[in-house]
Structures are given as C-alpha cells and as structure tokens.
Interface confidence: medium
C-alpha cells in the first residue's frame, strides 16, 4: 500500500523558521502535492502550497519556498510571522495525488519537546482515504 510520511523541523539557525518535509512511498507517478496546515486539505485545513511536476508551484504566506527534493518528496519552508509561534502546535498535512493509486494524505507536527534542528520522526501513516 502507498504511504505518505511527514517531518516537521525547526531550523537551528532561525527559531522563527520551520520546514515541512513530505514524501510518497509507493509506485506510480505523482501528479500533484498539496500541503496544508490546521488539518487535512478540504477538512478545515488551509492550503500553504501546491506543487505540480510540470505546472510548477504555488504558495501562500507564511510559506516561503516550496520545492521538490526528489521525484517523490517535497519540502516547504515557512516563516513564522509573530511571537505567538503558531507553527509550534500546528498540524501540517501533505496530500500526494498519484496515478493510478489515487490520493494519499498524512499529517505531522513539531514534537512538543523539539530542540532547534530536531525533526519529528517520519510518520508514514495515511490518515485519509485513497480517492
């Protein structure tokens, strides 16, 4: 079965910067990746970035840079905008649409006791459906 993993890490150099890493483990080709925060895409979450292998990327503040790391993984750099540090207790979700498998989504967040530079372990648990 295809799986999606999500890692959230705080940058050691800039405490206000976070990076979300997501990857797809499975066969098939990826047609679209959607990163959202606050919940799954379409279920209360709001989009931060959309990455298309051919049409490029589209992102919204506070997302700073969305990019492909490999053919099946992406990273999204975020810039925390205020002292309240909303990223620290926020859920980030990545949805990979692949052909012919369908859509797979998984979520992750920064561990409560995270030291700068420490990332959450990969969580390859699909929390949503295969469309």
């Amino acid at each position: 079965t295809p799986e999606v993993w999500v890692q959230v890490q705080m940058e050691a150099t800039e405490l206000s910067s976070f990076t979300v890493h997501c990857g797809f483990l499975g066969p098939g080709s990826i047609s679209l990746v959607t990163v959202s925060w606050g919940g799954p895409d379409g279920a209360g979450g709001t989009k931060l970035a959309v990455l298309h292998p051919e049409l490029g990327t589209r992102q919204w503040a506070p997302a700073r840079q969305a990019r492909w790391e490999t053919q099946s993984s992406i990273s999204l750099a975020l810039e925390d905008s205020g002292a309240s540090s909303p990223f620290a207790n926020t859920t980030f979700c990545c949805k990979f649409a692949s052909f012919p498998e369908g859509s797979w989504e998984s979520c992750g967040s920064l561990p409560p006791s995270s030291d700068p530079g420490l990332s959450a372990p990969p969580t390859p648990v699909p929390i949503l459906r295969a469309d």
Epitope: S36, W37, G38, G39, G42, G44, G45, T46, K47, L55, R58, Q59, W60, A61, P62, D80, S81, G82, S84, P86, F87, N89, T90
Partner: antibody, heavy 119, light 107 residues
Framework: EVQLQQSGPELVKPGASVRISCKAS????????MHWVKQSHGKSLEWIGY????????GHNQNFKSKATLTVDKSSSTAYMEFRSLTSDDSAVYYC????????????WGQGTSVTVSS | DIQMTQSPASLSASVGETVTITCRTS??????LSWYQQKQGKSPQLLVY???TLTENVPSRFSGSGSGTQFSLKINSLQPEDFGSYYC?????????FGGGTKLEIK
C-alpha cells in the same frame, strides 16, 4: 447568513495607533482565512494581509509588514487589525473579507471602516 | 510580485450595450483570478472567481474568461444597476494584488 460586522469610523492623530475589529457570524470562524484590504479615497484596492484563525498564522504584504498587526479572538469570532505609526497616507477605508480555505475566492466582505488621520 | 494591468480605466456605455473589461498579469497565473464589482460607498462584491466561475446570485449577463496572463469580464445587455467600479484580483499565491479598477459610467 454569513456576516462580517466591522467597527465604526475612527479619527486619529498622526503617530497614533488604531485597532479595527471585524466580527464574523453565520459560519465556523476558524475554517476560513480573514483578509484585510485598504482602499484610499477614489483609489483601487490594496491587499494588506491575512490571518488563519485556527492557529493565528498570518501572511502579509511586505509593504504593510511593519505597519499592520493581525490578530483574532476565537471565543468571540472576531478578527482585529492594529495599524501603528499612522500618517495621512493611512487615511482610507479598511475592509475585512473572508476567504475559503482553497484560496479560491474572497466571498464575503465587511462594510468597511473609515480611518481618518488628522491633527 | 505579480502586477495587474486593468483596462480601460474608465468606460461610458448605455443601458443595453455589451462591454468588456480586461486584466493582464505580469506572470502566468493560470485561472487564479477574481472579478469584483463595487458601488460608491459600498464594499466590493465578488462576481467571478477562478477566472470564469460565476458567484451564486450573479446574473448570467456577467461572464469571465481567460487564463495565463490575459483575462476579461464581459457584461451583456448592461442594466442600470451594473454601473460602478470593477476590479480584478489574482490569488496565485501571496501577495494578492488588485488591478487599478475600471469605472463604468452611464453614457
């Protein structure tokens, strides 16, 4: 029925700050982004920024980053924008507007709050 | 940042006429464009989003078209209530920007 009710007009002195409120009703406040837009007299619209009430995360137009602070009070479903170090250039009507989470449309707007900066 | 060039800046037309307002963007924004109508002293009202999707309760005489960098809003058979200002806005990532506006006046 979705409604965004903004606070009343403000007359403020140069250098002062002002806080405008936008009370939302008729929908789940934390499920939608809240945007703020400026319109100077007789001019076009200028996007200031937005806040995601679910977690307080914000995004700004860089032109307003040091000028505007966006906050929310989830308990009262109210969004706030504080504008500081006001000058005559900040005299304008300010609107709040709800945006669906897909970033497709800003479908409901407040009635606007007029801010006049004058000594 | 994406620049929005809206034209014409002003337009005079008669009731019953058909008018077209255009919006050009500095970068490809695919279909991520909205059109708003604003009456004097009122808030903007969403007419069209995603370039061509009409908002609920907006009359069918309004239509949006275009993709990439060229967009247009067409109003068939102008009605008295259609006069006012019109703005385009992109939502292809932040910062969102608006066009300079088109003031539609009665001839």
């Amino acid at each position: 029925e979705v409604q965004l009710q903004q606070s009343g007009p403000e007359l403020v002195k140069p250098g002062a700050s002002v806080r405008i409120s936008c009370k939302a009703s008729g929908y789940t406040f934390t499920d939608y982004n809240m945007h703020w837009v400026k319109q100077s007299h007789g001019k076009s619209l200028e996007w200031i920024g937005y806040i995601y009430p679910y977690n307080g995360g914000t995004g700004h137009n860089q032109n307003f980053k040091s000028k505007a602070t966006l906050t929310v009070d989830k308990s009262s479903s109210t969004a706030y924008m504080e504008f500081r170090s006001l000058t005559s250039d900040d005299s304008a009507v300010y609107y709040c507007a709800r945006e669906d989470f897909r970033h497709e449309k800003m479908d409901y707007w407040g009635q606007g709050t007029s801010v006049t900066v004058s000594s | 940042d994406i620049q929005m060039t809206q034209s014409p800046a002003s337009l005079s037309a008669s009731v019953g006429e058909t008018v077209t307002i255009t919006c050009r963007t500095s970068d490809n924004i695919y279909v991520y464009l909205s059109w708003y109508q604003q009456k004097q002293g009122k808030s903007p009202q969403l007419l069209v989003y995603n370039a061509k999707t009409l908002t609920e309760n907006v009359p069918s005489r309004f239509s949006g078209s275009g993709s990439g960098t060229q967009f247009s809003l067409k109003i068939n058979s102008l009605q008295p209530e259609d006069f006012g200002s019109y703005y385009c806005q992109h939502h292809y990532g932040t910062p969102y920007t608006f066009g300079g506006g088109t003031k539609l006046e009665i001839k």
